[in-house]
């Protein structure tokens, strides 16, 4: 049951995630214009991957998409490339999982198997949580670099330095939108990598043991100490550990060829 | 269509308030900025401020702050100026205006103008 | 505050020759995110408010003759009126549009020749 409500929950913060991510590439605000001890001016600009937009005090927007990929910073391609690899990532990593679920039930679908592809897209999940982490972030040190710069070289658009009034820029909404939601995949994937250890069954587990003493033949089951029920002062308590979670459907244990003494 | 309309001359003493109206029509009142702008007799046009009447926003020339007040009335569409502690300096045609939708931040439309005499 | 320079003060122009004004700010009204001046030229005849020739430097609005035009961009631009007809007789401001407080030039008297 412990399982399930992992692995399920691992799903849903991950697809809370990749919708997050999704949402923040798409987003305009990136970068927005820094009001604090700048000149007021009765525009607003704000930038994101894909366009730019300005707003008038009068509530009109424009927005212009960048147009040129040469012309564009090396560090805005790379932001987008992690965003959208992030993206397939998470997307891939969510199909996989939804035939991983254990309360789905697909044809004659073994648990390892179910383990194996909730394993997988645990590390999918991961992996696009960090892309979606490592783009925001490259994006943020780009912002921070250039909010610093001096005033005759300030950053005023995505097509490089423009010798113009000064525009600063600072984090946007989409940048806080994109750390959480990288932050939740990446939590998601990690939650189905651990429900991956629980659905996964063991090749090595000790499940029964004979154990003879004075005639009388006890069978001790995996699960902590047991009271003998045999005669006799040699009689012992004897631990037999599990190695590994058991499943509900694992009622009957067969002992190896080692589990005799 | 739009219009804005307002209030009559005035004359003031030294030290007194004046409060202009500018009573709009022909749009949603509550979409717009409107602004003011005074012009002294034979000088130029000088900007005194603007409010959202849907919020009350307001941003005020920092030569008028604390003298100059904008009110907005949603249930009349009408705005107020009011203007404290006048002088003489203050006799002025007031003007207010509408500011456009995406026009650059200009003002489309204007009122008549009123006439505010400063004099002892 | 922006300091909007205008010149000249008046200008004396014959029927349908080319008037041009010119208007100079202490800073750039070029917005590098749209690319925009947000320079406004109005056009205020004796005894009435101002009147909405130009917004965005360049662009005319409606209702406006084709006769008026606008150019410049950054700190220095020029309002043009291609043949000068009686009408035309009036006052001419710029202002600035971008930053607060907004300001305005100031102003130029056209008349006939």
């Known amino acids: 049951m412990a399982v399930t409500a992992c692995q399920g929950l691992g799903f849903v913060v991950s697809l809370i995630g990749i919708a997050g991510i999704i949402a923040a590439t798409c987003m305009d605000q990136w970068s927005t214009q820094d009001l604090y001890n700048n000149p007021v001016t009765a525009v607003f600009n704000y930038q994101g991957l894909w366009r730019s937009c300005v707003r008038e005090s009068s509530g009109f927007t424009e927005c212009r998409g960048y147009f040129t990929l040469l012309g564009l910073p090396a560090m805005l391609q790379a932001v987008r490339a992690l965003m959208i690899v992030g993206i397939v990532l998470g997307a891939i990593g969510l199909l996989v999982s939804i035939f991983a679920l254990k309360c789905i039930r697909i044809g004659s679908m073994e648990d390892s198997a179910k383990a194996n592809m909730t394993l997988t897209s645990g590390i999918m999940f991961i992996v696009s949580g960090l892309c979606a982490i490592a783009g925001v972030s490259v994006f943020a040190n780009m912002l921070v670099t250039n909010f610093w710069m001096s005033t005759a070289n300030m950053y005023t658009g995505m097509g490089g330095m423009v010798q113009t009034v000064q525009t600063r820029y600072t984090f946007g909404a989409a940048l806080f939108v994109g750390w959480v939601a990288g932050g939740l995949t990446l939590i998601g994937g990690v939650m189905m990598c651990i429900a991956c250890r629980g659905l996964a069954p063991e090749e090595t587990n000790y499940k029964a043991v004979s154990y003879h003493a004075s005639g009388h033949s006890v069978a001790y089951k995996p699960g902590g100490f047991k009271a003998s029920t045999g005669f006799g002062s040699n009689t012992k308590n004897k631990k037999i550990y599990d190695g590994g979670a058991r499943t509900e459907d694992e009622v009957q244990s067969y002992p190896s060829k080692h589990d005799y003494v | 269509q739009v219009q804005l309309v307002q209030s009559g001359a005035e004359v003031k003493k030294p030290g007194a308030s004046v409060k202009v109206s500018c009573k709009t029509s022909?749009?949603?009142?509550?979409?717009?900025?409107i602004h003011w702008v005074r012009q002294a007799p034979g000088q130029g046009l000088e900007w005194m401020g603007r409010?959202?009447?849907?919020?009350?926003?307001?941003y005020y020339n920092e030569k008028f702050t604390g003298r100059v007040t904008l009110t907005a009335d949603t249930s009349t569409s009408t705005v107020y100026m009011e203007l404290s502690s006048l002088r003489s300096e203050d006799t002025a045609v007031y003007y207010c205006?509408?500011?456009?939708?995406?026009?650059?931040?200009?003002?489309?439309?204007w009122g008549q103008g009123t006439t505010v005499t400063v004099s002892s | 505050d922006i300091v909007m320079t205008q010149s000249p003060d008046s200008l004396a122009v014959s029927l349908g020759e080319r008037a041009t004004i010119n208007c100079k700010s202490s800073?750039?009204?070029?917005?590098?995110?749209?690319?925009?001046?947000?320079l406004t030229w109005y056009q205020q005849k004796p005894g009435q408010p101002p009147k909405l020739l130009i917004y965005?430097?360049?662009t005319r609005e409606s209702g406006v003759p084709d006769r008026f035009s606008g150019s410049g961009s950054g700190t220095d631009f020029t309002l043009t009126i291609s043949s000068l007809q009686a009408e035309d007789v009036a006052v001419y401001y710029c202002?600035?549009?971008?930053?607060?407080?907004?300001?305005f030039g100031g102003g130029t008297k056209l008349e006939i020749k």
């Open positions: 205006s509408r500011e456009g939708y995406g026009k650059g931040n200009s003002m489309d439309y």
């Open positions: 022909g749009y949603i009142f509550t979409n717009y900025w």
């Open positions: 409010i959202y009447p849907g919020t009350g926003n307001t």
């Open positions: 800073q750039s009204l070029l917005n590098a995110g749209n690319q925009k001046n947000y």
């Open positions: 965005w430097a360049s």
């Open positions: 202002q600035n549009a971008y930053y607060y407080p907004y300001t």
